[in-house]
């Protein structure tokens, strides 16, 4: 008799990353009998929800259900029907919603209420929506990349699964850049973490980790740009802002009300004699870099050393994975190669920012102008943040690896979040058995 293929004994999980600029849905899959093994969970699908982040729906809450439909229907298609009821769904909202909550807890709750009601109509095991803390965002990003890199596995491999993997059990640090916040997370070398708020203790797979993390709210690339504009318009002599972070020939009208809408610009707010102003690009990397540095207060530090704004930062240690917008921006600028030195990156940025806007539009005809116009700022901001903010140097630059995916799974906080909520990261090393029960048929 012919052997009949046994049904795949797999499980699925869904995480929605409700970021400040957009929402993405991730579907993960793993063998049911290997839940406690490291490296078995992998991403099978990413669905980017069309539209802005959920915090932008404050005035149109009734549209949230429709907004989520396409990606939730996609999940319904990808996951076998027999598994729907057992598949957990988690939604984590990040800095966009943290900012909305700062403005109004009631409005943030209203958005989350409608999100939860909408998601509960699907046949999955919906586990709620919540605003995760910056500390969680940093920690789960760190867990994700180290899980995918196999850093928690006790078995040392003689082969490398990714090009930049150093074949040891030293964990990678995590650098995450979003639209509204940025996170830095790593294990410092024998250094006490001087501020308790930045210290995390984990026991994973039988090993203890003392982890440093900090999330800089308002220092994601979009909010940093708003900050920079609010700072620079203070000293503008009229309603024209000549901006070195935009290409020569670029022009854009900005409403002052939009500029001051976010809590991130409150410190720069002032009464202006106009309701609108026009950005006129002049495309000068060096001046742009200087303007960005003014967002980082480095004059005050109550610790042995700081990043900026009086936030403790231990000496950098080991390799770092830089993902999310760190990766997307550098990938667009073609600067993710391991071989490109920091000096070369700076040189390329100088050239890129100096290119006329008309030329840029022609070269990148397929890219939306809104995004295209901001790559000069974003690239410059990344360099400023990493070099002056986090104190990377030309030498330590080679320890930064710009990562989009690791073994097919996106680098980011969502996988770590799901692993934690489904209890798939044991504190102790699971006992390895020669054959699992499912091996016997």
């Amino acid at each position: 008799t012919q052997n009949k293929a046994l049904p795949e004994n797999v499980k699925y999980g869904i995480v929605l990353d409700a970021g400040s600029s957009h929402t993405s849905l991730y579907i993960y899959k793993w063998p049911a009998e290997k839940e406690n093994d490291t490296g078995v969970v992998h991403q099978v699908e990413e669905c980017r929800v069309k539209g802005p982040g959920i915090s932008k729906f404050v005035q149109k809450v009734n549209e949230i259900g429709i907004y989520l439909t396409d990606c939730m229907e996609r999940a319904r298609e990808v996951i076998p029907r027999s598994q729907h009821q057992e598949t957990p769904v988690y939604l984590g909202a990040t800095a966009g919603m943290r900012l909305l909550r700062m403005e109004s807890e009631e409005l943030a709750d209203r958005v989350l209420d409608v999100v939860e009601r909408s998601l509960s109509n699907y046949p999955f095991d919906f586990q709620g929506a919540r605003i995760i803390t910056g500390q969680e965002e940093g920690a789960y990003g760190w867990i994700t990349i180290n899980y995918l890199l196999g850093k928690f596995s006790q078995k040392t491999r003689w082969f490398s699964i990714v090009p930049y993997e150093t074949n040891n059990q030293e964990t990678f640090g995590a650098l995450d850049l979003g639209g509204a916040s940025t996170q830095v997370t790593f294990v410092p070398q024998n250094q006490t973490i001087e501020s308790p708020d930045n210290a995390l203790q984990f026991r994973l797979y039988g090993k203890d980790y003392n982890v440093y993390t900090h999330s800089f709210l308002c220092y994601g690339k979009d909010q940093a740009l708003w900050q920079k504009l609010a700072k620079d318009i203070q000293v503008a002599s009229n309603e024209i802002l000549r901006d070195p972070c935009f290409h020569p020939g670029y022009k854009k009208v900005v409403n002052v009300s939009d500029l001051y809408k976010t809590p991130c610009t409150k410190r720069f707010e002032m009464t202006l004699p106009f309701q609108q102003f026009e950005i006129q690009g002049i495309g000068n990397y060096q001046q742009c870099h200087q303007s960005i540095l003014e967002l980082f207060n480095t004059s005050y530090c109550p610790y042995s050393q700081c990043a900026f704004n009086g936030i403790f930062l231990p000496p950098l240690q080991g390799d770092f994975g830089a993902f999310s917008a760190f990766y997307f921006v550098m990938k667009f600028l073609n600067l993710t190669s391991e071989k490109v030195s920091q000096e070369k990156v700076t040189e390329m940025m100088k050239k890129f920012c100096a290119q006329p806007w008309e030329e840029i539009k022609t070269s990148y005809a397929g890219v939306k102008e809104k995004y295209l116009s901001e790559y000069c700022f974003s690239g410059t901001y990344i360099l400023s943040l990493l070099l002056q903010g986090y104190h990377f140097t030309a030498d330590s630059w080679e320890h930064i690896h710009f990562i989009g995916k690791i073994q097919g799974s996106d680098a980011g906080w969502t996988l770590g979040y799901m692993l934690n909520l489904t209890n798939m990261i044991p504190a102790e090393q699971p006992l390895s058995t020669p054959l699992s029960h499912s091996t016997y048929v």
Partner: antibody, heavy 119, light 107 residues
Framework: QVQLVQSGAEVKKPGSSVKVSCKAS????????IGWVRQAPGQGLEWMGG????????NYAQKFQGRVTITADESTSTAYMELSSLRSEDTAVYYC????????????WGQGTMVTVSS | EIVLTQSPATLSLSPGERATLSCRAS??????LAWYQQKPGQAPRLLIY???NRATGIPARFSGSGSGTDFTLTISSLEPEDFAVYYC?????????FGGGTKVEIK
């Protein structure tokens, strides 16, 4: 003080539909949610679904999905619950109740509407 | 969905006695648990919300405690009007679910 007043008792045949109304008075109808809960004779309470009238956002218990429709009319401050393909097991008292904010319980209840399904 | 298990199903006590009702959730509901009282032919009435907060107009003899998965409703000294059915309900996750109820009857 907010009050919820429901429509009167109904007797229905199996396979038919019933539509129960719930009129709010003395408060801002649109800013909170209305939930529907039923109770079969001698049994416990069972949540069926709810709606936020201001946004038209309704959600339903999986058990009733496809058979229940919850709507609201802001102009008359009235919420409706329609249950189709009735069977004898649907004989119950149907309550509407207010749930004022996210993750809050039902703080104000209607008086209940008895629906009897019998051939 | 979250299953709420109430115990005991029936509690036979005399007026003036202390009543302790239990509600256990199949998974954590944080502190989003409410207690209702229902008398025959009447709609339920909210007694306690967010595990331990008394609703408007509820006498001080009613108190709630617990968080996560284990919750308790205590009636410090039973009054004749307290003999009724009591339900717990979670509002942490959808679908909203109720416990099966505890009937507090006169001994």
């Amino acid at each position: 003080q907010v009050q919820l007043v429901q429509s009167g008792a109904e007797v229905k045949k199996p396979g038919s539909s019933v539509k129960v109304s719930c009129k709010a008075s003395g408060g801002t109808f649109s800013t909170y949610a209305i939930g529907w809960v039923r109770q079969a004779p001698g049994q416990g309470l069972e949540w069926m679904g709810g709606i936020i009238p201001a946004f038209g956002t309704a959600n339903y218990a999986q058990k009733f999905q496809g058979r229940v429709t919850i709507t609201a009319d802001e102009s008359t401050s009235t919420a409706y619950m329609e249950l189709s393909s009735l069977r004898s097991e649907d004989t119950a008292v149907y309550y509407c109740a207010r749930d004022p904010v996210r993750r809050s319980p039902f703080d104000i209840w209607g008086q209940g509407t008895m629906v009897t399904v019998s051939s | 969905e979250i299953v709420l298990t109430q115990s005991p199903a029936t509690l036979s006590l005399s007026p003036g006695e202390r009543a302790t009702l239990s509600c256990r959730a199949s998974q954590s509901v944080s502190s989003y648990l409410a207690w209702y009282q229902q008398k025959p032919g009447q709609a339920p009435r909210l007694l306690i919300y967010d595990s331990s907060n008394r609703a408007t107009g509820i006498p001080a003899r009613f108190s709630g405690s617990g968080s996560g998965t284990d919750f308790t409703l205590t009636i410090s000294s039973l009054e004749p009007e307290d003999f009724a059915v009591y339900y717990c309900q979670q509002s942490f996750l959808w679908p909203r679910t109720f416990g099966g109820g505890t009937k507090v009857e006169i001994k």
